[in-house]
């Protein structure tokens, strides 16, 4: 058993039929010595008396808010949560496996630049009685500070008969060094509590591996005289690290016909303009990627040829 | 050329070669997420590689103030990786494919290090760790780790030279 926060404790249980469970001793936080009784949740049934209560925790019915009283007055509370371990593996019931980029990916994180700011998100089908707490650091043995905000519900999607909820959190490295080569990964830890179930999820990454620039901005077309060619121009996204002479991007320009089956013409360039042939009803799209490190491409910025 | 005394390197040449190094490093180990190398235990391997750290002056301001600190750190790293790529980690079993970009990568590391430090000038270099993995699978894992680490290193070096070519060239 360990303390998650004040008066909230996590009991780690091997979860299998007829498991013996864990013996837990609760102590009433009071100078009083006698006349103390214990109850669980809203029930008025007295579970025991005395300053300490010894319980065998085997299942969710044994978890909950234990309260010690004296003469009708509440003295203190202890909330017991369960962390299930099945076949040696901690349960992951609360969050959905996003399966990208690999199986057992529960947390996904992205950064728009090298400033040390990043966003992580996760999915669940659970809509109520759910809380998240996020902590992060750079490195684990001698951790350096990363400050995370509160997790918020960022999207709600309908998946068949069920809804799926996306939560996200923003974190910022306290002393970020955008130009340095990272040697210690960022660690992100999410505590999830649904009713009386506790679970924790972790992710470890370098900022450079989760970079995904915003799409190029101000995408414009300039027809060239007496030609089917157009000059496409764009700018670095505002959110990208500066100076651009140091934090450079590379770009992919694509001409795509109306039909998805039509052949796509693609040009790669380090410049912020390119000359392409504009076909009728086609559109021109541009996306960006770090020039020197192959992290994710941005989403496409698009304009119609006409 | 970057002479220890402090004259400027051939920024544009260094820029071109470092960008080529980036391309080669990624073609040598293109599978991002092929395996999470941090899950495989970091042993003494990549802990010993020279990283370009915050105080090394490789940021835009540090380069403007005095690029020598940064160039020396980059040089150290290039020599280190050049030695690693020439060691039995890469020459031993399992053999690299004949068209593997590792050979080109090795040569380009050497080329860039020579651009930074011509013969007769000596910056101190970092001692290469004695890594002699006994099993072929250990060697393979070590190659992946080294190449992943090299990708990060050459990306920073390429940014330095691109910025230098754009802002510090005479």
């Amino acid at each position: 058993i360990w303390e998650l926060k004040k008066d909230v404790y996590v009991v780690e249980l091997d979860w299998y039929p007829d498991a013996p469970g864990e013996m837990v001793v609760l102590t009433c936080d009071t100078p009083e010595e006698d006349g103390i009784t214990w109850t669980l949740d809203q029930s008025s049934e007295v579970l025991g008396s005395g300053k300490t209560l010894t319980i065998q925790v085997k299942e969710f019915g044994d978890a909950g808010q234990y309260t010690c009283h004296k003469g009708g007055e509440v003295l203190s509370h202890s909330l017991l949560l369960l962390h299930k371990k099945e076949d040696g593996i901690w349960s992951t019931d609360i969050l959905k496996d996003q399966k990208e980029p690999k199986n057992k990916t529960f947390l996904r994180c992205e950064a728009k630049n090298y400033s040390g700011r990043f966003t992580c998100w996760w999915l669940t089908t659970i809509s109520t009685d759910l809380t998240f707490s996020v902590k992060s650091s750079r490195g684990s043995s001698d951790p350096q500070g990363v400050t995370c905000g509160a997790a918020t519900l960022s999207a709600e999607r309908v998946r068949g008969d069920n809804k799926e909820y996306e939560y996200s959190v923003e974190c910022q490295e306290d002393s970020a060094c955008p130009a340095a080569e990272e040697s210690l990964p960022i660690e992100v830890m999410v505590d999830a509590v649904h009713k009386l179930k506790y679970e924790n999820y972790t992710s470890s990454f370098f900022i450079r591996d989760i970079i995904k620039p915003d799409p190029p901005k101000n995408l414009q077309l300039k027809p060239l005289k007496n030609s089917r060619q157009v000059e496409v121009s764009w700018e670095y996204p505002d959110t990208w690290s500066t100076p651009h002479s140091y934090f450079s991007l590379t770009f992919c320009v694509q001409v795509q016909g109306k039909s998805k089956r039509e052949k796509k013409d693609r040009v790669f360039t380090d410049k912020t303009s390119a000359t392409v042939i504009c076909r009728k009803n086609a559109s021109i799209s541009v996306r960006a990627q770090d020039r020197y490190y192959s992290s994710s491409w941005s989403e496409w910025a698009s304009v119609p040829c006409s | 050329r970057a002479v220890p005394g402090g004259s400027s390197p051939a920024w544009t040449q260094c820029q071109q070669l470092s960008q080529k190094l980036c391309t080669l490093a990624w073609s040598a180990h293109p599978l991002v997420g092929h395996m999470d190398l941090r899950e495989e235990g970091d042993e003494e391997t990549t802990n010993d590689v020279p990283h370009i750290q915050c105080g090394d002056g490789c940021d835009p301001q540090g380069l403007r103030d005095n690029s020598q600190f940064c160039l020396q750190r980059i040089h150290q790293g290039l020599i280190f990786y050049e030695k690693l790529l020439g060691s039995d980690i890469f020459t031993g079993e399992p053999s690299l494919l004949p068209d593997s970009p590792v050979g080109q990568l090795h040569a380009s590391l050497l080329g860039l290090s020579q651009l930074l430090q011509p013969e007769g000038h000596h910056w101190e270099t970092q001692q290469i760790p004695s890594l002699s993995p006994s099993q072929p699978w250990q060697r393979l894992l070590l190659r992946f780790k080294i190449l992943r680490s090299l990708q990060a290193f050459v990306a920073v070096a390429a940014r330095v030279f691109a910025h230098g070519a754009a802002t510090l060239s005479p």
Partner: antibody, heavy 117, light 108 residues
């Protein structure tokens, strides 16, 4: 601590109807409330809940046919455009207070709604 | 999400025992309650958290199970136990909520 439904009557299809659940002996700001219905000779079917903070959650089949709202002492169920399939006894119940998704330990006697032309 | 109750109807003698099963289509941990309903009356809570007896309910009623399989057992049957019994999952309103189809208990 009690709850009591009212407003059930005979209506023609398409005529909106609002059922009211009056509560006494407890505060709606402490408990989840649920509306459940039971067609003649059938089982219990949950319609929706309103949490202590006023958030509403509906069963997937509801699809905008009902809305739940509350005041300080009442919980309303509005039937937007009833059909004959909505003929049932409608129950209001109070949660235990432990959770939003809760079990229910205080039930009203129910109010009968008949939808017929 | 589905809660399947079996059997739909059961007949038992006074002083006998009845077992009703409730199966969830996914794990709901122990977030299951049982209700008793008599004709013309609202449901009455018997069991919550799969096995905890509600206030004032005789100990002849007991609940067990967790995950997806749950059981309500009524021992030492009385005529007053003739009613329809419903299980209810309250895991989450989106990811596992609702009532079972009901089991009619006839006491002979």
């Amino acid at each position: 601590q009690s709850v009591e439904e009212s407003g059930g009557r005979l209506v023609t299809p398409g005529t909106p109807l609002t059922l009211t659940c009056a509560v006494s002996g407890f505060s709606l700001s402490d408990y989840t409330m649920i509306w459940v219905r039971q067609a003649p000779g059938e089982g219990l079917e949950w319609i929706g809940i309103i949490s202590s903070s006023g958030n509403t959650y509906y069963a997937t089949w509801v699809k905008g046919r009902f809305t739940i709202s509350k005041t300080s002492t009442t919980v309303d169920l509005k039937m937007i455009s009833p059909t004959t399939e909505d003929t049932a006894t409608y129950f209001c119940a109070r949660g235990s207070g432990a959770y939003i998704s809760d079990y229910f330990n205080v039930w009203g006697p129910g109010t009968l709604v008949t939808v017929s032309s | 999400f589905e809660l399947t109750q079996t059997p739909s109807s059961v007949e038992a003698a006074v002083e006998g025992t009845v077992t009703i099963k409730c199966q969830a289509s996914q794990s709901i941990d122990s977030w299951l309650s049982w209700y008793q309903q008599k004709p013309g009356q609202p449901p009455k809570l018997l069991i919550y958290a799969a096995s905890k007896l509600a206030t004032g309910v005789p100990s002849r009623f007991s609940g067990s199970g967790s995950g997806t399989q749950f059981t309500l057992t009524i021992g030492d049957l009385e005529c007053a136990d003739a009613a329809t019994y419903y299980c209810q999952s309250y895991y989450d309103v989106n990811a596992g909520y609702g009532f079972g189809g009901g089991t009619e208990v006839v006491v002979v």
